[in-house]
């Protein structure tokens, strides 16, 4: 029951997280005009990953897309890439995790397969969350750098007569949405990985232990306590779960069919 709850909660948390990552990626307010310690303007500028917008006091808002690809800063391209990879991995993870849910029965799918799928989706959620957090953090770092650079030469005087105030940008709402969403996706992924361990419990076989009342020797047959690593020799006994303590090689090789993402 606890495993089902952990898996279900992990799925829901990841779902909310990925929805948040998608929302953050689409939002226009990644960076917003810094209003602190600046002259009050009748224009408010804000920028997203895909377009920049200007909201006038009049009520009009005008947004213009970044129609160039090569002319954009490499950092912005990197952030876009990280967010998209996060969304794609998260979406695939959601798809896999739906079939992995213990409460959903699909044909005669065994628990070992469900455990594998749960672990796979968990890893995908973790990577997805990390991608989003990394993307948002890279953008935030870019903003901080630009902020202090523009503060250093905030007033660029023309012969000391005319002053041009540079527009400074600060953190927009999308950054906070992205951080929270990335964190939720990460937490959801960890929960899925924990649930996977519960789905594939350690198999303990108490077999053929012979007690001799008269003697002091206890005979243990070699197949007694068996760790379910998937490499066990005792394969003619009960089905061994694959999803428990698996080797690193196995964990990494399973999602290799998604390496093109």
């Amino acid at each position: 029951m606890a495993v089902t709850a952990c898996q279900g909660l992990g799925f829901v948390v990841s779902l909310i997280g990925i929805a948040g990552i998608i929302a953050a990626t689409c939002m226009d307010q990644w960076s917003t005009q810094d209003l602190y310690n600046n002259p009050v303007t009748a224009v408010f500028n804000y920028q997203g990953l895909w377009r920049s917008c200007v909201r006038e006091s009049s009520g009009f808002t005008e947004c213009r897309g970044y129609f160039t690809l090569l002319g954009l800063p490499a950092m912005l391209q990197a952030v876009r890439a990280l967010m998209i990879v996060g969304i794609v991995l998260g979406a695939i993870g959601l798809l896999v995790s739906i079939f992995a849910l213990k409460c959903i029965r699909i044909g005669s799918m065994e628990d070992s397969a469900k455990a594998n799928m749960t672990l796979t989706s968990g890893i995908m959620f973790i990577v997805s969350g990390l991608c989003a957090i990394a993307g948002v953090s890279v953008f935030a770092n870019m903003l901080v750098t630009n902020f202090w650079m523009s503060t250093a030469n905030m007033y660029t005087g023309m012969g000391g007569m005319v002053q041009t105030v540079q527009t400074r940008y600060t953190f927009g709402a999308a950054l906070f949405v992205g951080w929270v969403a990335g964190g939720l996706t990460l937490i959801g992924g960890v929960m899925m990985c924990i649930a996977c361990r519960g789905l594939a419990p350690e198999e303990t076989n108490y077999k053929a232990v012979s007690y001799h009342a008269s003697g002091h020797s206890v005979a243990y047959k070699p197949g007694g306590f068996k760790a379910s690593t998937g490499f066990g020799s005792n394969t003619k006994n009960k089905k061994i779960y694959d999803g428990g303590a698996r080797t690193e090689d196995e964990v990494q090789s399973y999602p290799s069919k998604h390496d093109y993402v």
């Epitope: 303007t41 500028n45 920049s52 200007v54 006091s57 009049s58 009520g59 002053q163 527009t167």
Partner: antibody, heavy 118, light 113 residues
């Protein structure tokens, strides 16, 4: 057709109060920022106050800060300017204006005359 | 506050003549976000409220004759009337629409010779 009609002007003594109204029609009142602009006899226009479409942002000219209050009632399509502690230099024609692109004052009313005199 | 300086204060012209008037702001009115200059030109005739002619320094308001042209960027702006008509005799004001307070220039009065 956009129409702005000001009312509430008149003769008032220094230190007195007055409330101007501006009835708007012909456009979505709650979609636009609005402003009050005044023009003293034989002088240029002077911006007095601004209010955003939702009344979230409000700005005043330094000369009227603390004495004038701009407000709006979107349900009634009406803009207000409450004036107190009036001075002789507040004597002017008061216009209500609807903002347009570029924060320009795209539409103006015909104005209401406010005279502050003893 | 942003100071808007208009010159000349008055212009005496003949019909059909080309007229140019200047407006200078104490700070740049160029918004980096959309690369637009938040400067507006108005025309005011006696007994009437001002009428919007040009916004964003160079965008003509609908219904305004194309003989009116706005130009300039940053701090220096110009209003040009290619061929003055009798109905153009009025006072022309420029306005800063970027910084609060939204200040007006003192105006340029266009008079007939």
């Amino acid at each position: 057709e956009v129409k702005l009609v000001e009312s509430g002007g008149g003769l008032v003594q220094p230190g007195g109060s007055l409330k101007l109204s501006c009835a708007a029609s012909g456009f979505g009142f709650s979609d636009y920022g609005m402003a009050w602009v005044r023009q003293a006899p034989r002088k240029g226009p002077e911006w007095v106050a601004f209010i955003s479409n939702s009344a979230y942002s409000i700005y005043y000219a330094d000369t009227v800060t603390g004495r004038f209050t701009i407000s709006r009632e979107n349900a009634k399509n009406t803009l207000y300017l409450e004036m107190s502690s009036l001075r002789s230099e507040d004597t002017a024609m008061y216009y209500c204006a609807r903002l347009g692109r570029g924060n320009s004052f795209a539409y103006w009313g015909q104005g209401t005359l406010v005279t502050v005199s003893a | 506050d942003i100071v808007m300086t208009q010159s000349p204060s008055s212009l005496t012209v003949t019909a059909g003549e080309k007229v140019t008037m200047s407006c200078k702001s104490s700070q740049s009115l160029l918004n980096s976000g959309n690369q637009k200059n938040y400067l507006t030109w108005y025309q005011q005739k006696p007994g009437q409220p001002p009428k919007l002619l040009i916004y964003w320094a160079s965008t003509r308001e609908s219904g305004v004759p194309d003989r009116f042209t706005g130009s300039g960027s940053g701090t220096d702006f110009t209003l040009t009337i290619s061929s003055v008509q009798a109905e153009d005799l009025a006072v022309y004001y420029c306005q800063n629409n970027y910084y609060y307070p939204l200040t007006f220039g003192a105006g340029t009065k266009l008079e007939l010779k």
